[in-house]
């Protein structure tokens, strides 16, 4: 999953039990409330490693957001925390529980509003907007050679049907803002810019909203000129992680390359007590590399199962093409198994699965 920086989560003081799989729980909270969303394993059996997702984007634990395998606890809700929340099995991405959360300006009275007076008579449950294909929205960086065309899409659903608008670098974006204009297809949730130029570089945000909530996705566009270059790796990935002994961990590495990239995952090791060779090159072992049946998508994720203390250390995503190489590194800290609900420190995500 992708760990977005704009996503925040909601809560209220009482724990809310999860709905049956396939059902969507409609919840309304007041501003400033705290919540515990609970997702017990289906049938009471073991559920394995899980991940909590808001509007298709993985939630990052923080001081305000506490993530456990069966619970999501969040403090001090605000309007931006409205959205679609789900608990998924990490490996299969199967949705175990799904919640539609709306945060109102007024603090809640403790009773869940059902919003019937506001609902359009469509015969369908009302709900905040959500991404229809969240797994397609994990790439955020688009690097395009000048003179080509860019298409951004944010397909969403909700009831009532949400509207979509677009921002560039946080400001309203309209056709008159660029030479050549833009093409919008609201039914396709699309923005098209033909024949891009360097001045088109920037952050493009789709804002999808209805009266029950708002979700947004930001894409970064880089317009490339002249010569090809070595691969671009998305900033912040892979991210440092802290994991509990025996849990599963995923490192992510987003690679953009015009020329076909070759991606490898490396773990830094010590040889005779030294981390680097005589020439200063780090000692590494190759954990994952391209094979006959390996896709680029698969290579962008390194999965570590049932981690041990020996798995702790530095991991590197190395991407190369005919022009050159780029690499980003991250650290894994492995803690002894203690409590299921843990807080992340500033180093990164915690998965107690």
């Amino acid at each position: 999953e992708s760990l977005g920086t704009e996503q925040r989560v909601v809560g209220r003081a009482a724990e809310v039990p999860g709905p049956e799989p396939g059902q969507q729980e409609q919840l309304v909270f007041g501003s400033g409330d705290a919540v515990e969303l609970s997702c017990p394993p289906p049938g009471g059996g073991p559920m394995g490693p899980t991940v909590w997702v808001k509007d298709g984007t993985g939630l990052v634990p923080s001081e305000r957001v506490l993530v456990g395998p069966q619970r999501l606890q969040v403090l001090n809700a605000s309007h931006e925390d409205s959205g679609a929340y789900s608990c998924r099995q990490r490996l299969t991405q199967r949705v175990l529980c799904h919640f539609s959360v709306r945060v109102t300006d007024a603090p809640s009275s403790g009773d869940d509003e059902d919003g019937e007076d506001e609902a359009e008579d469509t015969g369908v449950d009302t709900g905040a907007p959500y991404w229809t294909r969240p797994e397609r929205m994990d790439k955020k960086l688009l690097a395009v050679p000048a003179a080509n065309t860019v298409r951004f899409r944010c397909p969403a659903a909700g009831n009532p049907t949400p509207s979509i608008s677009w921002l560039k670098n946080g400001r309203e974006f309209r056709g008159e803002h660029r030479i050549g204009g833009i093409k919008l297809r609201h039914q396709q949730w699309s923005l098209v810019m033909e024949s891009v130029v360097p001045s088109d570089r920037g952050n493009y945000t789709c804002v999808v909203e209805n009266k029950f909530g708002s979700i947004r996705q930001t894409y970064t566009l880089d317009v490339l000129e002249r010569s090809p270059h070595r691969p671009i790796l998305q900033a912040g990935l892979p991210a440092n992680q802290t994991a509990v002994l025996g849990s599963d961990v995923e490192f992510h590495c987003k690679v953009y390359s015009d020329a076909q990239p070759h991606i490898q995952w490396l773990k830094h090791v010590e040889v005779n007590g030294s981390k680097v060779g005589p020439d200063g090159t780090p000692y590494v072992t190759v954990l994952k590399t391209a094979g006959a049946n390996t896709t680029d998508k698969e290579l962008e994720v390194l999965s570590l199962h049932n981690v041990t203390f020996e798995d702790a250390g530095e991991y590197t995503c190395l991407a190369g093409n005919s022009i050159g190489f780029s690499h980003h590194s991250a650290w894994l800290v492995v803690l002894p198994a203690e409590e299921e609900l843990v807080e992340a420190d500033e180093a990164g995500s915690v998965y107690a699965g």
Epitope: R136, P145, A147, T149, R151, F152, R153, V192, S195, A259
Partner: antibody, heavy 127, light 107 residues
Framework: EVQLVESGGGLVQPGGSLRLSCAAS????????ISWVRQAPGKGLEWVGR????????NYADSVKGRFTISADTSKNTAYLQMNSLRAEDTAVYYC????????????????????WGQGTLVTVSS | DIQMTQSPSSLSASVGDRVTITCRAS??????LAWYKQKPGKAPKLLIY???FLYSGVPSRFSGSGSGTDFTLTISSLQPEDFATYYC?????????FGQGTKVEIK
Amino acid sequence: EVQLVESGGGLVQPGGSLRLSCAASGFTFTSTGISWVRQAPGKGLEWVGRYWAWDGSTNYADSVKGRFTISADTSKNTAYLQMNSLRAEDTAVYYCARTYGIYDIYGGYTEYVMDYWGQGTLVTVSS
Amino acid sequence: DIQMTQSPSSLSASVGDRVTITCRASQDVDTSLAWYKQKPGKAPKLLIYSASFLYSGVPSRFSGSGSGTDFTLTISSLQPEDFATYYCQQSTGHPQTFGQGTKVEIK
């Protein structure tokens, strides 16, 4: 004004070779590409291959792979289609077309669109 | 390869008619579909890209729709210059493939 002009077509015997040229003007294809498409007499369009100038990559249809080679001289703004081991079924009008990419981050692919076409040059493979 | 099948193969229509041509892909091509128009002895011309986006300079009587495997090209009011052969083409899969063409003739 964008223009593409093909040349080099003609009559060639089976097993022979021919080199087609596509001279471009009104744009530079350093960031875009050139595709070759052919049309046998009375038949539909068949994509032959594409040269992507940004990284110099090429892609080919299975029917011509290993026999045809697409290249370009960016200083001359000209693309080439080198055709070897020609067969009777290669007889067609060959078009070059400026090709640009529609980069769709959500779909996870690049859609290649041919927006300007040359007038075509006829290649006849016959003994 | 992804097979593109157009229907009908040919049709007869009059000036002012509304004409619809369909294109079906043998597998999902998302919205990676373009439509081209070709007159006899001439090179093809791009009409529509990404299934529904009108290429610059193309009259608004042309429109495209669809996604996945089923696509439609519509000419809302046929004009004399529209009598031609129309091709769909996908490029999300390799190789790019065209439909067999639909010939629009004068009734």
